[in-house]
């Protein structure tokens, strides 16, 4: 099933996925004046096994005399199997690069891609929130949101973060970028109440979630 909504917006905050669960799809979008190459992939797909995950397919854009008005389509499962596999890896990746089992990293940029990337996430995907420059974080709990399946419906958990209008006290590069934990915290599938614990992404292990897909977009 699709996650019906985008992750919640928090005033004066920005969110980002640090890794993408297997099954995540990314539309191959090109910026104005460019279009996907003929017979090019509609999307990239995060796929793999427990020890290694990578993006299948490669997005490619070519110059276009006319605007690309191709409607984006969410690929069907049978389409996914037929796609050619092309692993995309960024050159010169540091050896200390974090890797999460069952997750893909952000795909490297491709030439003349669209400004915005449109992802189709699976249930269990996490996004992480931080206050934008000039605002300070007041944590009441985890500054993250997880796409969950509850009572047969998908929803995003509410990040427990407030950003106040005081200048951030931490200085670059002292803060640490949150490391994505594989999946969401355990939460009862029979209870509609959301319970959260302290924000400790780096040290927590998490529970396995069902697989479904939703669409969101962020820059």
């Amino acid at each position: 099933e699709l996650c019906d909504d985008d992750p919640p917006e928090i005033p004066h905050a920005t969110f980002k996925a640090m890794a993408y669960k297997e099954g995540t799809m990314l539309n191959c979008e090109c910026k104005r004046g460019f279009r996907r190459i003929k017979s090019g992939s509609l999307y990239m797909l995060c796929t793999g096994n427990s020890s290694h995950s990578s993006w299948d397919n490669q997005c490619q854009c070519t110059s276009s005399a006319t605007r690309n008005t191709t409607k984006q389509v969410t690929p069907q499962p049978e389409e996914q199997k037929e796609r050619k596999t092309t692993e995309m890896q960024s050159p010169m990746q540091p050896v200390d690069q974090a890797s999460l089992p069952g997750h893909c990293r952000e795909p490297p940029p491709w030439e003349n891609e669209a400004t915005e990337r449109i992802y189709h996430f699976v249930v269990g995907q996490m996004v992480y929130y931080q206050c934008v420059q000039g605002y300070r974080a007041l944590h009441r709990g985890p500054a993250e949101s997880v796409c969950k399946m509850t009572h047969g419906k998908t929803r995003w958990t509410q990040p427990q973060l407030i950003c106040t209008g005081e200048m951030e006290t931490s200085q670059f590069p002292g803060e640490e970028k949150p490391q994505a934990s594989p999946e969401g915290r355990p939460e009862s599938e029979t209870s509609c109440l959301v319970t959260t614990t302290d924000f400790q992404i780096q040290t927590e292990m998490a529970a396995t979630m069902e697989t479904s897909i939703f669409t969101t977009e962020y820059q």
């Epitope: 992750p7 917006e9 920005t14 940029p109 669209a114 934008v132 590069p173 803060e175």
Partner: nanobody, 130 residues
């Protein structure tokens, strides 16, 4: 695949200046933070500076504030790092890197960490003699 190509490194005396340039032909600048890391011999790679390709906001490591200036030319798909008042401690291999912006086209300094960049250049060597 899209590549980042650095240039401008070299040997300079302490107190001198250098201008590094990163060419990113085909990169959609307004979807990324673009900037610089450096790695001195035997040390970890550290973030130096970046510019938000969407809104032009910049950030600098404390060690280079007031001495380094980052700028971009989105039309030419280049990002430059003007390095003034160079010190021996600034000697390192300088790498260009890009990282995807967050929602709303925003970017925060704590994301500018070596393991998490989306794409790297091969680096250019800066040597500062005392």
């Amino acid at each position: 695949q899209l590549q980042l190509v650095e240039s401008g490194g070299g040997l300079v005396q302490a107190g001198g200046s250098l201008r590094l340039s990163c060419a990113a032909s085909g990169l959609t600048f307004d979807g990324y933070a673009i900037g610089w890391f450096r790695q001195a011999s035997g040390k970890e790679r550290e973030g130096v500076s970046y510019i938000n390709g969407r809104d032009g906001s910049t950030f600098y490591a404390d060690s280079v504030k007031g001495r380094f200036i980052i700028s971009s030319d989105n039309a030419k798909n280049t990002v430059d790092l003007q390095m003034n008042s160079l010190k021996p401690d600034d000697a390192a291999v300088y790498y260009c890197a890009v990282d995807r912006l967050g929602s709303r086209g925003a970017y925060v300094s704590s994301w500018w960490r070596s393991p998490d960049m989306d794409l790297w250049g091969k680096g250019t060597l800066v040597t500062v003699s005392s």
